[in-house]
């Protein structure tokens, strides 16, 4: 689609005549008619295919004509066409006299004509304006004309259509050859898909307008490269959405149980070594002087009873000192000055003479230790019992009391509350310092995950790649329905 | 009113020549162009060419190139058909008609000229 | 040279209905979205009459009865309704290449 235009600029009849040579009375009353046709070897009569227009009077005899004076009001003429322009043309440019007002053909005198041209040729689409000039015997004829496409036609032949658009179609202006250019921020054939941020990972995330980065389900930040970990996931880390890839010293479906509670939470105090005992527990050793579960408790250098033979201990800032019975001496009061004859063993012991009469020894009962079998035996001096267990001295042994979740002659096992299996369908169980958690599936919760609940199965957006996620109710498990060109029970594989 | 009026009927000898006038008048003689056309006795329509009246540009049917010539006089407003080496299949009515470039057709016709060829 | 093929050759017609004549070329007489075909009445012992040009456009004087459609090598001439005074010869002809070339005619008669 496209406009032939023809601009008339001068037209010279200097002697006032009609083309049979007899002069117009008073003169020529010009007007023009144009026929624009198919290209013809010989112009030849027939339709004017291209089109034809025609202008009111433009001047007598001789006369420039004016920029926009012809055509009803416009120079130059416009003679448009709605098919490709085939690059040649045949002209035909009639100058007629009208003596009236009336230019209809049967209005006007049988010898009317003042001058005929006929010209063909090629003429390519452009801007430029071709001058030409025709003369006959009687006239002349100054005017230019070129072919330019319509609004929104491009191309050698105004054949392209391409109108510029800025909308949901497409976002582009037209090329002078019609070929599109797409605004910036978008890209593709029309122009209607947005370049996303720079870096928004191609698969991950997408966007609706430009420099826009929209994550797809299990995918977060700025560039859509952080993949959201399990719901819940305390101390763990995804390399794809959903994942809960516990840290060091971290177990468990959520990653929140501690199996490095030493290292966490350094609980043993006053220097004493900690060592890991599964989850959540631990033993403290303390150095000497320290004791209690976490070390915590400084010992008085007596309370190891250090004095013998009935001695009693003071604590001192250095140290302690033994105050001695009568017949003993020494440091710990370990030396006697007493012999069997002094009847010093005490609670049924026996006393033995030694280097000849000068030292004894007591033999003592089961029960009684000391020098002097002045003590009662404390098999829990040592604090045998690991895990806070209580020792208790039942006669010739001892026993531990454990605390709860522990077990063995040293409470120094840990009993599962979680071996007898205490969550229901399908519940994972926790072992806690004071009983267990249960971690309960979707649909089900209470203590021990046997209360049923309705849930969404989609409520995670579990499907990739903008897959439609639907919840089987009988199961209340999801199921991906996948776009083309993806594949998985969670739609995570481009096919190929 | 428009009228193209011919020359009167004529009666030749094979291989003779002969020249058919038509007169126009009601118009402007040299924005037109001037068709010839054929009827032999009972049959159809044939073309034999056109001239335009304007600058004599002719266009010729190549069944009848070499045996016609066409010609205006624009001072009386007159067209001409010679045809020449006549035979006895050149025995026909002979028209002109008019026609302009912006296509109406041939609307106006002249009534006719009998030619006869015989020996 | 493009053939016109006219049909049917002859036809009776009573008055008042409607006569429908074909034409059909060798090859299409479009060009640039124009149909070159023209149509004419010939009576006896006149000369041609011009009745459609342009397949469809009516000519100068003619009746409204006659209407003429078509394009690229398909036409016809409708005449409705029939008139005593529309018995005659009726041709097409084609005037989109050197030689312009004429139908063989259809005689139109009353029933």
């Known amino acids: 689609s496209g406009v032939f235009q023809l601009q008339l600029q001068e037209f010279i009849n200097e002697r006032g005549v009609l083309a049979s040579g007899r002069p117009c009375e008073p003169g020529c009353r010009t007007f023009f008619r144009v026929c624009l046709k198919h290209f013809q070897a010989v112009v030849s009569p027939g339709p004017c295919t291209f089109g034809t227009v025609s202008t009111p009077v433009l001047g007598t005899n001789s006369f420039a004509v004016r920029d926009d004076s012809s055509g009803g009001g416009r120079n130059p003429l416009q003679l448009p066409f709605n098919f490709t322009w085939p690059g040649t043309f045949s002209l035909i440019i009639e100058a007629w006299h009208a003596p009236g007002d009336d230019l209809r053909p049967e209005a006007l005198p049988p010898d009317a004509l003042i001058s005929k041209i006929a010209i063909q040729g090629s003429l390519a689409v452009g801007q430029n304006w071709l001058l030409d000039e025709q003369t006959s015997t009687l006239t002349r004829l100054r005017y230019s004309y070129r072919v330019i496409c319509s609004d929104n036609y491009y191309g050698d032949n105004c054949s392209r259509l391409c109108k510029k658009r800025n909308d949901h179609f497409g976002h582009y202006v037209c090329q002078p050859d019609g070929n599109l250019s797409c605004l910036p921020g978008w890209t593709g054939e029309y122009c209607q898909q947005p370049i996303c941020l720079s870096g928004c990972h191609e698969q991950n995330g997408y966007c609706s307008k430009p420099a826009e980065c929209l994550c797809r389900p299990g995918w977060q930040g700025r560039l859509c490269n952080e993949c959201i970990p399990h719901n819940g996931c305390r101390h763990g880390t995804c390399s794809t959405p959903w994942q809960c890839t516990c840290d060091e010293g971290w177990g468990g479906l959520f990653c929140d149980q501690d199996l490095n509670y030493c290292t966490h939470h350094s609980p043993c105090k006053n220097g004493a070594t900690c060592s890991n005992s599964g989850q959540r527990s631990y033993t403290c050793t303390c150095r000497p002087g320290y004791t209690g579960v976490d070390c915590e408790l400084e010992l008085s250098e007596c309370d190891s009873n250090p004095c013998r033979n009935g001695g009693s201990c003071k604590d001192q800032e250095d140290g302690y000192h033994c105050l001695c019975p009568p017949g003993y001496y020494g440091l710990h009061c370990e030396h006697s000055t007493l012999s069997c004859a002094d009847s010093p063993c005490f609670n049924g012991g026996s006393c033995r003479e030694r280097n000849q009469g000068a030292n004894y020894a007591c033999e003592c009962p089961p029960n009684f230790t000391g020098s002097n079998c002045e003590k009662k035996v404390d098999r829990c001096t040592s604090n045998p019992c690991a895990n806070g267990g209580q020792c208790l001295n039942r006669g010739p042994s001892r026993m531990c009391r454990c605390r709860p979740g522990f077990t063995g002659t040293y409470c120094e096992l840990h009993v599962s509350d979680c071996a007898r299996n205490p969550c229901a369908h399908g519940g994972t169980c926790h072992d806690l310092e004071n009983g267990l958690m249960c971690t309960c599936p979707a649909g089900f919760s209470g203590r021990r995950c046997e209360v049923r609940t309705s849930i969404d199965a989609c409520a995670s957006s579990p499907c990739f790649n903008r897959a439609t996620c639907y919840t089987d109710l009988s199961t209340d498990t999801f199921v991906c329905n996948c776009p083309y060109g993806f594949v998985g029970s969670r739609c995570e594989f481009p096919v190929g | 009113q428009v009228q193209l009026v011919q020359s009167g009927a004529e009666v030749k000898k094979p291989g003779a020549s002969v020249k058919i006038s038509c007169k126009a008048s009601g118009y402007s003689f040299t924005a037109y162009y001037i068709h010839w056309v054929k009827q032999a006795p009972g049959q159809g329509l044939e073309w034999i060419g056109y001239i335009s009246c304007y600058n004599g540009a002719t266009n010729y049917n190549q069944k009848f190139k070499g045996r016609v010539t066409f010609t205006t006089d624009t001072s009386t407003s007159t067209a001409y058909m010679e045809l020449r080496s006549l035979r006895s299949d050149d025995t026909a009515v002979y028209y002109c008609?008019?026609?302009?470039?912006?296509?109406?057709?041939?609307?106006?016709w002249g009534q006719g000229t009998l030619v006869t060829v015989s020996s | 040279d493009i053939v016109l093929t006219q049909s049917p050759a002859s036809l009776a017609v009573s008055l008042g209905q409607r006569a429908t004549i074909s034409c059909r070329a060798s090859e299409s007489v479009d060009n640039y979205g124009i149909s070159f075909m023209k149509w004419f009445q010939q009576k006896p012992g006149q000369p041609p009459k011009l009745l459609i040009y342009?397949?469809?456009n009516q000519g100068s004087g003619v009746p409204a009865r006659f209407s003429g459609s078509g394009s690229g090598t398909d036409f016809s001439l409708n005449i409705h309704p029939m008139e005593e005074d529309d018995t005659a010869m009726y041709f097409c002809?084609?005037?989109?290449?050197?030689?312009?070339?004429f139908g063989g005619g259809t005689k139109l008669e009353i029933k």
């Open positions: 002809q084609q005037s989109k290449e050197v030689p312009w070339t």
């Open positions: 342009a397949a469809s």
């Open positions: 008609a008019r026609d302009y470039d912006y296509d109406v057709g041939m609307d106006y």
